[in-house]
Interface confidence: low
């Protein structure tokens, strides 16, 4: 049999070898596709089948607009003028090229020596599903589950049957390397079909804090507290000599004397926000801790609030 690949929505014509120039009863097509239950028989004398397929005068079978449900096996049996039976057998597969893939939520900056999300590559409208692959500086990036992690997701549209692919890349860049260039490509895996490439992204690699990096500890854990409760933030840093520690809320310095501990007693909603501490060390200037989101909630439900918090003041602050 012959393998045929056809693009969804386009016409497909299958020729019937040995078909007589003026067909009589001596030609028939048998189809086993997603539209048929087992085999469907079509003959030149029969009606066109649901506008899906019809036999042309030369015996060829025409499908005016092929779809996913037309994938399957097509067989023609014809008797030539000499009375010899000639069979044609086709295995038909369909494809659809998706739109150009793109990297959504691309990182503009990566921190060396820690896992960072580079971005999510998205391809929409393919058939068959195909594959997404990542490239670093033009070379294929092989996920190893450690320094390079790829999370993939494939969804199929319930009506069109076309696929959406998502591939999230997380990397742990080395320190002191060059600026990496990441790109992603989609491949249908069909012969003579070139991969589709995204525009490249070039996040800069930020050096991590020195070994004596800052840790921000929060009590209660998770940073969610009931109104009237107490929150204790502790800025832990192993540097010697100990640096001055200042406190930041929503990007603004809190006017307090430097201290490694920030105590928020009897908290109210005005105390909610994103807190971090800044250590000023003679050898490498100010270093900021990762942020902690403090939430004041009646029910004590856990969870992170997203986005910026515009501070409009603090309640009582004690050190």
């Amino acid at each position: 049999g012959q393998n045929i690949t056809a693009r969804i929505g386009e016409p497909l014509m299958l020729s019937c070898k040995g078909a007589p120039k003026k067909p009589t009863q001596k030609l028939e097509w048998k189809l086993n596709t997603g539209r048929t239950e087992a085999w469907k028989v079509l003959s030149p004398q029969g009606d066109p089948w649901d506008s899906v397929a019809r036999i042309l005068p030369n015996g060829s079978l025409l499908l005016p607009a092929i779809g996913i449900v037309d994938e399957g096996t097509f067989r023609c049996r014809a008797t030539n003028r000499l009375g010899k039976e000639v069979k044609s057998n086709y295995r038909v597969r369909v494809y659809q090229i998706p739109g150009k893939p793109e990297i959504v939520n691309p990182a503009s900056e990566l921190t060396a020596n820690v896992p960072n999300k580079v971005g999510t590559c998205v391809s929409e409208g393919s058939y068959p599903a195909g594959t997404l692959s990542w490239h670093l500086d033009g070379k294929p990036l092989i996920p190893d589950g450690k320094g390079t992690v790829v999370k993939e997701e494939t969804r199929r549209h319930p009506e069109t049957g076309l696929f959406t692919l998502r591939s999230e890349l997380t990397v742990t860049p080395a320190q002191g390397g060059t600026t990496p260039t990441y790109s992603c490509s989609f491949s249908l895996g069909l012969p003579r079909r070139r991969p589709l490439n995204t525009a490249p992204i070039q996040p800069r690699v930020r050096e991590p804090l020195p070994p004596e990096g800052i840790q921000l500890l929060v009590e209660p854990e998770g940073g969610t507290v009931a109104p009237g409760g107490t929150v204790t933030l502790t800025c832990a840093i192993s540097a010697q000599p100990p640096p001055q520690i200042h406190w930041i809320k929503d990007g603004t310095p809190l006017p307090l004397a430097p201290s490694p501990v920030l105590l928020l007693p009897e908290v109210g909603h005005e105390d909610e926000g994103i807190y971090s501490c800044v250590a000023t060390h003679p050898s490498h200037g100010p270093q900021e801790s990762p942020p902690v989101n403090i939430r004041v909630t009646e029910t004590g439900d856990e969870g992170q609030a997203a986005g910026s918090v515009d501070g409009s003041g603090l309640g009582t602050l004690a050190l």
């Epitope: 200042h246 929503d250 990007g251 310095p253 006017p255 994103i274 200037g285 603090l314």
Partner: antibody, heavy 117, light 109 residues
């Protein structure tokens, strides 16, 4: 050399909006907070708000909440301030300044905004 | 909102020591107000001099120093020079906002 380069003067109509940019160079943009300040003609300075480029978190003077919106584009090391629903009261020189939490060492040259019909 | 008050103008001579002060309407200025001092020269040229009461900004000459004198923040210029003629603004952090003073016009004759 550390520099904050601000956009040139803007002449805008009442009710319109304007977006001022402040492009940082010569230092790591995400390591410092960006402060925005207003200087009205013949008056002192007024603090508008801060943005932390590393996290994108903002903090506003309540007087300017709703009037000013602060954003950053880390890829181009640029801070932006959009002023909405402009009136003649908003005619002023607007400055960005780099802050490392306890001093504002480097300032932009200022952007003059004139609101006039 | 707090009001921050400065001397409107001061005059000094080259080589002299001059002190500019900054008062808060809410009471004594403390280290918790993180007093800042900013210099404005003609054509809107601003430079940060002092932050956190007494931290000199990088590159600022040693003749500029910040301190607390009594209940006020102070900027002292030891051995003033003609190029120090400018307007000096102080700024104080309060719990949720930053307030600038009206500025002191310093003349060096």
């Amino acid at each position: 050399e550390i520099q904050l380069q601000q956009t040139g003067p803007e002449l805008v109509k009442p009710g319109a909006s304007v977006k001022i940019s402040c492009k940082a160079s010569g230092y790591s943009f995400t390591d410092y907070i960006m402060l925005w300040v207003k200087q009205s003609h013949g008056k002192s300075l007024e603090w508008i708000g801060n943005i932390n480029p590393y996290y994108g978190s903002t903090f506003y003077n309540l007087k300017f909440k709703g009037k000013a919106t602060l954003t950053v584009d880390k890829s181009s090391s640029t801070a932006y301030m959009q002023l909405n629903s402009l009136t003649s009261e908003d005619s002023a020189v607007y400055y960005c300044a780099r802050s490392d939490y306890w001093y504002f060492d480097v300032w932009g040259a200022g952007t003059t905004v004139t609101v006039s019909s | 909102q707090a009001v921050v008050t400065q001397e409107s103008a001061l005059t000094t001579s080259p080589g002299e020591t001059v002190t500019l002060t900054c008062r808060s309407s809410t009471g004594a200025v403390t280290t918790s107000n993180y007093a800042n001092w900013v210099q404005e020269k003609p054509d809107h040229l601003f430079t940060g001099l002092i932050g956190g009461t007494n931290n000199r900004s990088p590159g600022v000459p040693a003749r500029f120093s910040g301190s607390l004198i009594g209940d006020k923040a102070a900027l002292t210029i030891t051995g003033a020079q003609t190029e120090d003629e400018a307007i000096y603004f102080c700024a104080l952090w309060y719990s949720n906002h930053l307030v600038f003073g009206g500025g002191t016009k310093l003349t060096v004759l």
